[in-house]
């Protein structure tokens, strides 16, 4: 049974979508900036029709590894999922590996495609650059995601975001549109444009098929 709640905003994305939020947990963002990042994710979630039937969400914080807070198959009320997203911990680590989190997205989150009819999107919120030794397989993971029809949308935040990786992601597929922001302060301004873009990439649900009328048999 679908756990639904009334929409909180006029714009409300009711499409077939599996959306993964990937949050940079490096010290390139201060604790306060990470708070803005979390608020952005929660604000976005408020604008999605979250349920197992419509928009499924996952939330992952990444540093040198990946920490999943919400999985695509989690059957919880949207308000409860937003509450969990608001409690993502700030790691403030030296490194946030985009390669590791894309690998995690490829082999853990989208290992099995159980909703082929839905669009699959990874929103990669990145504010830092991983060391070169960690990025050896970066392109391989992006290509692997492309093979699984996972759209990767990088959102570069601030002066330390890895523009080279953002450009590589964009090159892989025309849908992989990047948003490059000078600071977390621009997230709120860009939110509606990002939500609209994601929503436009996802299919609408097909109309419900009605069972054929039973032929009446008279004896």
């Amino acid at each position: 049974e679908d756990i639904s709640e009334p929409p909180l905003h006029d714009f409300y994305c009711s499409r077939l979508l599996d959306l993964v939020f990937l949050l940079d947990g490096s010290s390139r963002l201060s604790e306060a900036e990470f708070e803005v990042l979390k608020a952005f994710v929660v604000d976005m979630m408020e604008r999605l029709r979250i349920s197992q039937k419509w928009v499924r969400v996952a939330v992952v914080e990444y540093h040198d590894g990946s920490h999943a807070y919400i999985g695509l198959k989690d059957r919880k009320r949207p308000s409860e999922l937003r509450r969990i997203a608001s409690q993502v911990k700030y790691a403030g680590s030296q490194v946030a590996s985009t390669s590791e989190v894309l690998k995690y997205t490829l082999f853990q989150i989208f290992s099995k495609i159980d909703r082929p009819e839905a669009s699959r999107i990874a929103l990669l919120l990145m504010a830092s650059q991983e060391p070169q030794r960690m990025s050896r397989n970066f392109v391989r993971y992006v290509q692997g995601l492309k093979k699984k029809k996972v759209i990767v949308i990088p959102v570069g935040i601030g002066p330390h975001a890895n523009l080279k990786q953002i450009r590589l992601i964009e090159k892989q597929a025309p849908e992989n549109k990047a948003f490059v922001l000078s600071s977390v302060d621009e997230l709120e301004q860009q939110r509606d444009e990002i939500v609209s873009y994601l929503c436009d990439l996802a299919p609408e649900a097909p109309p419900p098929t009605l069972p054929p009328h039973m032929a009446q048999v008279t004896v």
Epitope: A32, E35, S86, K89
Partner: nanobody
């Protein structure tokens, strides 16, 4: 369990400065995120600013550039330095605390611990 005590309010002329203070007791202060909110007469309580456990800050657009939040983890205090005050800053100011990670910075319902409030009146 944290107890918060606000102080430093008063009546000033427009353009003046004022420093509010909030003393915390009964918890590991350094592990808390702190915020200031205010409530003007007949209006809802609104977010003013936030300070993380690492000292990083956020401000509402209405006070940015005029107000500064700081904290002293050794003394278990957080301060709100208010400069170039305007009549529209007149309100009761509250400090609030929450565990580092549990919530959204501007949402008052995410802060379980509150000071009693201190009145700031700015006249033109």
């Amino acid at each position: 369990q944290v107890q918060l005590q606000d102080s430093g309010g008063g009546s000033v002329q427009a353009g003046a400065s004022l420093r509010l203070s909030c003393a915390a007791s009964g918890g590991t202060f350094s592990s808390y995120a702190m915020a200031w909110f205010r409530q003007a007469p007949g209006k809802e309580r609104e977010f003013v600013g936030f300070i993380g456990s690492d000292g990083s800050t956020l401000y509402s657009s209405s006070v940015r550039g005029r107000f500064t939040i700081s904290r002293d983890n050794a003394k278990n205090t957080v301060a709100l330095q208010m400069m170039n005050l305007k009549p529209e800053d007149t309100a009761v100011y509250y400090c609030a605390a929450r565990a580092r990670y549990s919530g959204i910075y501007y949402r008052e319902t995410d802060y379980p611990y509150w000071g009693q409030g201190t009145q700031v009146t700015v006249s033109s």
